[in-house]
Interface confidence: low
Amino acid sequence: VEVQVPEDPVVALVGTDATLRCSFLPEPGFSLAQLNLIWQLTDTKQLVHSFAEGRDQGSAYANRTALFPDLLAQGNASLRLQRVRVADEGSFTCFVSIRDFGSAAVSLQVAAPYSKPSMTLEPSKDLRPGDTVTITCSSYRGYPEAEVLWQDGQGAPLTGNVTTSQMANEQGLFDVRSVLRVVLGANGTYSCLVRNPVLQQDARGSVTITPHRSPTGAVEVQVPEDPVVALVGTDATLCCSFSPEPGFSLAQLNLIWQLTDTKQLVHSFAEGRDQGSAYANRTALFPDLLAQGNASLRLQRVRVADEGSFTCFVSIRDFGSAAVSLQVAAPYSKPSMTLEPSKDLRPGDTVTITCSSYRGYPEAEVLWQDGQGAPLTGNVTTSQMANEQGLFDVRSVLRVVLGANGTYSCLVRNPVLQQDAHGSVTITGQPMTFPPEAHHHHHH
């Protein structure tokens, strides 16, 4: 039996579900009574899940695995692993026995994004050029171990006196702490970049140190250069910071967040207290951090309509402002594939293959490919409809003349998340087979 699994490791986020794809080609007349399927850990041979004597024998792996019973007869022996943990990382072998026997191993690579680094400064007051300061960058609950890079305001690496430690917690997730000792110039921005090597995700924290009052007398307000990307339904932090002078108290602070284009008030702090949200009660400041110059805004349950630019106005004696962009995103669902006609197909027939993917944002890029990954640029019609929440449903239709056989793949790409959702259909001229669970590949 020829058993097929993906060449590349399956990358799964901690706490999410992962599909370990495995497929075989059932012969005509094949029935599930003939099938023996075993999933086991490659190294230890520990049983994970099995199918025998015509029925699912269930999970032997903490009740977190499942097969796809409706797809087994079509040759889909894939395994669903729920609530992925760091300890699941490794190789899983898929054994298929009908009359003959075949096996193949698929690797699971577990990952967890690192939190946005928190930055602390010691000493934090009365700084003068020439002082030595210790900047600590802390980022939490990532996997695997991070690469930590320090940069100056121009993005050039700071390779000086850096000490980085990484500690794993009980779940195997790492907390990273990196300390930079640096001699201050007239002023400077120090950024700590915590990189997840599997997700290719960079979490960045930065601190701007202005040892003496800015000669213009203006408040220097710092926001991230790049858009903040937030998933629909999650919370986002719009970072904004200023440098409080010695003796600064919150009674002196006026802080206003507003929509840059319409000037609509979002949130404010004045007269020594939080004046609250003026934006559907979905915003909050970080009150404990304001005195240290952290004027960031937390936006809860992000919606598509939130996308755009937010301005952070800070007034103490003087005044400063800066705008931060929020880019909203939502992943596209795994495409469902339909075929018309779906029976009695012969080479030379024209078929219509429809690929549908739902509830993504922003608009997707849709690409059709053949079995070799070459683009199919033929007769393709793609439409995208936004629902009431502004999320897009994508429908792409390919009309194609059949060869002897062929695989047709539809790739729905989210341009912001660099996330690809794959669906495919294999047409063999007589029986038609759908390949195993589509593979979501994340680019970062």
Epitope: G155, D226, V229, T260, S325, Q327, P415, V416
Partner: antibody, heavy 120, light 107 residues
């Protein structure tokens, strides 16, 4: 599909200014940094500057600071590059290009290029 | 600014050959290295970003490798349509800078 369409060729005298446009379609214009890159005849590629149309934020390379202005019109999804005090060595093909997301400075979509000739 | 040096500046190879182009950065740029292909009279096209990631629609005969300051673009089996000039570009630090280009011709 994602496309950047640039304005047509220009012939200018030394000392004059030129303004090249780049109309974007097929994606969310305000979410991607837009670059301007030029290429003198028979030469390599040279990055001039970039704009984030979402809020108008710009970055310029030192060489062109003070002489180049990049702007964007969100209502028409169009970016503009204006170069002033033209000299003969500004004769080049000028390209707009979209920066890919995530935070990597690679340019995944390019305009077809606009030829600017500076000649007395 | 970071200087990018490509070599060779031109090279001639036969269809089916394995072709390698190198690019060196004047300072460490981690993996922030991209490759473009430009055919005469046309705009550049992105081939590879972040050292080794193939842009969508790019044939798998193209691959990239390297880290830090030294990088390589490889075409595993040269095809007639690969005749073009290839540029590397660093994206580690603003301003982004390009290599001088490598002109690839068929023998």
């Amino acid at each position: 599909q994602v496309q950047l369409v640039q304005s047509g060729a220009e012939v200018k005298k030394p000392g004059a200014s030129v303004k090249v446009s780049c109309k974007a379609s097929g994606y969310t214009f305000t979410s991607y940094w837009m670059q301007w890159v030029r290429q003198a005849p028979g030469q390599g590629l040279e990055w001039m500057g970039t704009i984030y149309p979402g809020d108008g934020d710009t970055r310029y390379t030192q060489k062109f600071k003070g002489r180049v202005t990049i702007t964007a019109d969100k209502s028409t999804s169009t970016a503009y590059m204006e170069l002033s005090s033209l000299r003969s060595e500004d004769t080049a093909v000028y390209y707009c290009a979209r920066r890919g997301i995530p935070r990597l400075w690679y340019f995944d979509v390019w305009g077809q290029g606009t030829t600017v000739t500076v000649s007395s | 600014d970071i200087q990018m040096t490509q070599s060779p500046s031109s090279l001639s190879a036969s269809v089916g050959d394995r072709v390698t182009i190198t690019c060196r950065a004047s300072q460490d740029i981690s993996n922030y290295l991209n490759w473009y292909q430009q055919k005469p009279g046309k705009a550049p096209k992105l081939l590879i970003y972040y050292t080794s990631r193939l842009h969508s629609g790019v044939p798998s005969r193209f691959s990239g490798s390297g880290s830090g300051t030294d990088f390589t673009l490889t075409i595993s089996s040269l095809q007639p349509e690969d005749i073009a000039t290839y540029y590397c570009q660093q994206g580690n630090t603003l301003p982004p800078t390009f290599g001088g280009g490598t002109k690839l011709e068929i023998k």
